[in-house]
């Protein structure tokens, strides 16, 4: 499925709601061309929770959650705090469908911070909610060591130095 910039993916009204923050019309706004063959039906699946969730202005809605894409760049820790200040958290990706949604809404091809870092205490990659990464779903390219934080690029997860500055995504 090739989608040009600005096109709206139509979802069946009543079974799937929009990803924009204004009204439940069943439209998923796409800000960038897709790089994967994820079908319209797939993107609209399992989103009945959207019926009861309305997001703030500037936040996108998908599967009952709200997402905000930054335009500026910060370190991982500064990005983490930025999201906390807005009572949200850095992005936690649950599956490939969510990854596809994120990728469709990224406005550039550069690295973007997500809510995953390597904790020396647990010696493992951990999401900001404390849960471990599911290695059956996601593979992290790069070193697993102290001061490593995760960034996504073209639907892949990379290990980067936490002090590097990238854009980021908040979620609530």
């Amino acid at each position: 499925l090739l989608v040009s910039q600005g096109v709206l993916l139509k979802c069946q009204k009543g079974s799937c709601s929009n990803a924009t923050q204004y009204e439940d019309t069943g439209d998923l706004k796409v800000n960038n061309g897709t790089r994967r063959n994820i079908s319209n039906k797939d993107l609209c699946a399992s989103r009945s929770a959207d019926q009861t969730v309305l997001c703030q202005s500037e936040w996108l809605k998908y599967q009952g959650k709200c997402y905000w894409f930054s335009n500026e760049m910060k370190s991982w820790s500064d990005s983490y705090v930025y999201c906390l200040e807005r009572k949200s958290h850095l992005l936690i990706i649950h599956d490939q469908l969510e990854m596809a949604f994120i990728q469709k809404n990224l406005r550039q091809l550069n690295y973007v911070w997500i809510g995953l870092n390597f904790t020396s205490l647990k010696m493992t990659w951990t999401w900001v909610d404390g849960s471990p990464i599911d290695s059956k779903i996601f593979f992290i390219k790069g070193p697993a060591k102290e001061n490593s934080c995760a960034a996504i690029k073209e639907s892949k997860i990379f290990s980067e130095t936490c002090s590097s500055v990238f854009k980021w995504i908040c979620q609530y």
């Epitope: 204004y22 703030q56 936040w59 905000w68 705090v81 200040e85």
Partner: antibody
Framework: SLEESGGDLVQPEGSLTLTCTAS?????????MCWVRQAPGKGLEWIGC????????TYYTSWAKGRFTITKTSSTTVTLQMTGLTAADTATYFC?????????????WGPGTLVTV | AFELTQTPSSVEAAVGGTVTIKCQAS??????LAWYQQKPGQPPKLLIY???TLESGVPSRFKGSGSGTEFTLTISDLECADAATYYC????????????FGGGTEVVVK
Amino acid sequence: SLEESGGDLVQPEGSLTLTCTASGFSFSGSYYMCWVRQAPGKGLEWIGCIYTGSSGSTYYTSWAKGRFTITKTSSTTVTLQMTGLTAADTATYFCARDTGTTNWRYNIWGPGTLVTV
Amino acid sequence: AFELTQTPSSVEAAVGGTVTIKCQASQSIGSDLAWYQQKPGQPPKLLIYGASTLESGVPSRFKGSGSGTEFTLTISDLECADAATYYCQGTDRSSAPTWPFGGGTEVVVK
């Protein structure tokens, strides 16, 4: 609980610093400490907030920027510095704490302190 | 600028009656809205947060509803103690968050 202090009678164009002191908890957690004012017989007016986490970020309403400054001065005190005061700034000033949970809400308020210009 | 418009500014109702107060946001704020009750000489008291969640200890006669830009506070089975001014307060999660209040609604109980 929270308690405001420093309210006083001040001359026009004067300055004043109000202090909000917490008891029973400290500002070591990450949440917002905010200032709200209420002119006599009028409604509540949000002034600004400071995030008590590591960033110490401050946010103000448009009219307060440059004239009002919120600072965390210790683990239990937050101040509101006011300059260029006019008669329109005459009000009861409240400090309030946002809970720090996923929802936004001011669940702890001080009794207020009166500023007269 | 993000603003909240509260209506009516004043409402009168009898004991046992019902009062409805509306709050309109100038932009979508999801469910990030709280309601407060204030009596003369006292600080505001939190009633409802998250648009519809009742604060602990607040009677279930107080009900919040709405999302996006339209919100409502309904007080049923009015009691004399409900005579107060009620304020809505919203939050925007923008790059520079603000927490404005609505103009307030005075509730007079007959």
